[in-house]
Structure formats: structure tokens, C-alpha cells
């Protein structure tokens, strides 16, 4: 099939970088600047992708490959190929419409990026809290209340209370 | 070609005001939630204001709230953000963005960014 299509198609012998020209009879000419092809036998060069803006130039484009973004510090990429830039959050944080907003009393987020969860309940599991969260960390569980020894005491949460910091509304 | 250009910087007093435009073309403007940020010298980019399709919701951050509008003419596929009272931390570069496909639902992300405009405030 190769071979038949050779005989048919002089585009086929155009490499990678190249593309078959029907302005000049089918021979291999070079992709222009700021354009690619990435596979032979192709009767156009694809346009080089522009990191402009918020995306920065990861990877420069070359005559067989495209350029590769990713995203200004304060940033990280989304969607196949890094298609969007999202803006980071500190820690105890996530990205809202009304931009960066604390985590609700009861959820945390360790990351820059994602949503804001639920502290663990480690009631659930039959345990009591170790260590209590806040909104940069999840509780931590410790033993269950039978498997303290006689005498010890685990610590208890405290009373849901107003978020540290933060006035009644 | 998919693109957005920003215009109406410039030096202004401080208390002065001025309108930045942001023009997109290649793309159906009325589909997407529209953005501003801004880069002070030195700093990150910074997230000032966003709007959504139809202009209904529109966000600010604190510094800027009351002082600074976002609206847009989908008619004539333009941002535009409204300055007033403006103070010498104002003094950025002003950068329009387009919110991603599904912004404001699955993620608050952006994939179309203009060249900027520069905003000075200076006595």
C-alpha cells in the first residue's frame, strides 16, 4: 500500500518540517516561519501556537513541533495541552467568581488550586480527633475512645464556633 | 485569529479617571465570561473584575470596589472597565482575558489574553 501510494502521490516523500507545494508542483518545501508540520506527507504547515499573555513559552516551536505553554508564576495550567491558565489561591483557600475566598469554617484545602473539603470525620471510623483542622489542614484521627488506655483522653473538638479571625456576620 | 486588544491607558493624576477598552474579534463574545487583571511593576498578575455573558454578574476585588466598573456591549464585542478615583497602586499594566469554555462552573480559567494597556498614576 506504501509503495502504490508513493507511485500516486509525490506528497508522501514530503518529511516532517516540510509540506507538498501545488504551487510548485508537488515538490517539498519548507514550513514558513512560525509554522510546523509534525508528520509527512501534508499539503499545509499548521500555524505555531503564541504563548501570549498569562501563558509563557515552555517549549519553542520548531518546524516539526509546536510550541508547548504553560503559565506565569501565580498560575497553573488546565485542559489538554495547557489550553487555559487558572490563578493560584494560598493554602486554607479556594477560586471563586468573587476570586479568592477563605475556606468555610469545617473545610480545608492544603493546595493552591481545587476546592476547599470537608474535614475528615473521624467519628465515622469509630475514632476521635487528634489533631483539630483548620482551614489549611484536615483533622487528624487518632485511636478510637475504646482503645485509649484507662486514664488517657483523647482530644475533643471544640464547640463549633465562629471562624478564628473572622466577625459575626 | 482569535484575539483581544486593549486600549485607553495612559497618566492620570491621582483622583483622576479613565475607560479601558478591550476589543475581541474571531470568536462569538457573547458566549464568555470576560475578565480583567493587572500587573503591577515588580508584582503577579493580579484579578480585578469579571463579568459573565449577558453583563448580570459582575465581581470586583476589594480595592477596587466602588471605584472601578466592568460592563461590556456584546453588540459591539467590547469590554470596558470604568476607573475613578484612581490612586498611585493603580499603576499596572491592564490586561483583558477570555474565561474558558465552562467558566464559573467547572473551573475559573482563561485561554485568550490581550497585549495590555498601561495604566500610570502619577502627580
Known amino acids: 500500500f506504501e509503495r502504490t501510494r508513493s507511485l500516486q502521490d509525490p506528497c508522501s516523500n514530503c518529511p516532517a518540517g516540510t509540506f507538498c507545494d501545488n504551487n510548485r508542483n508537488q515538490i517539498c518545501s519548507p514550513c514558513p516561519p512560525n509554522s510546523f508540520s509534525s508528520a509527512g506527507g501534508q499539503r499545509t504547515c499548521d500555524i505555531c501556537r503564541q504563548c501570549k499573555g498569562v501563558f509563557r513559552t515552555r517549549k519553542e516551536c520548531s518546524s516539526t513541533s509546536n510550541a508547548e505553554c504553560d503559565c506565569t508564576p501565580g498560575f497553573h495550567c488546565l485542559g489538554a495541552g495547557c489550553s487555559m491558565c487558572e490563578q493560584d489561591c494560598k493554602q486554607g483557600q479556594e477560586l471563586t467568581k468573587k476570586g479568592c475566598k477563605d475556606c468555610c469554617f469545617g473545610t480545608f484545602n492544603d493546595q493552591k488550586r481545587g476546592i476547599c473539603r470537608p474535614w475528615t470525620n473521624c467519628s465515622l471510623d469509630g475514632k476521635s480527633v487528634l489533631v483539630n483542622g483548620t482551614k489549611e489542614r484536615d483533622v487528624v484521627c487518632g485511636p478510637s475512645p475504646a482503645d485509649l488506655s484507662p486514664g488517657a483522653s483523647s482530644v475533643t473538638p471544640p464547640a463549633p464556633a465562629r471562624e478564628p479571625g473572622h466577625s459575626p456576620q | 485569529e482569535v484575539q483581544l486588544v486593549e486600549s485607553g491607558g495612559g497618566l492620570v493624576q491621582p483622583g483622576g479617571s479613565l475607560r479601558l477598552s478591550c476589543a475581541a474579534s474571531?470568536?462569538?463574545?457573547?458566549?464568555?465570561?470576560m475578565i480583567w487583571y493587572r500587573q503591577a511593576p515588580g508584582e503577579e498578575l493580579e484579578w480585578v473584575a469579571n463579568i459573565n455573558q449577558d453583563g448580570s454578574e459582575k465581581y470586583y476585588v476589594d480595592s477596587v470596589k466602588g471605584r472601578f466598573t466592568i460592563s461590556r456591549d456584546n453588540a459591539k464585542n467590547s469590554l470596558y472597565l470604568q476607573m475613578h478615583s484612581l490612586r498611585a497602586e493603580d499603576t499596572a499594566v491592564y490586561y483583558c482575558a477570555r474565561g474558558g469554555e465552562d467558566y464559573g462552573n467547572s473551573h475559573y480559567g482563561m485561554d485568550v489574553w490581550g497585549q495590555g494597556t498601561m495604566v500610570t498614576v502619577s502627580s
Open positions: 474571531g470568536f462569538t463574545f457573547s458566549n464568555y465570561w
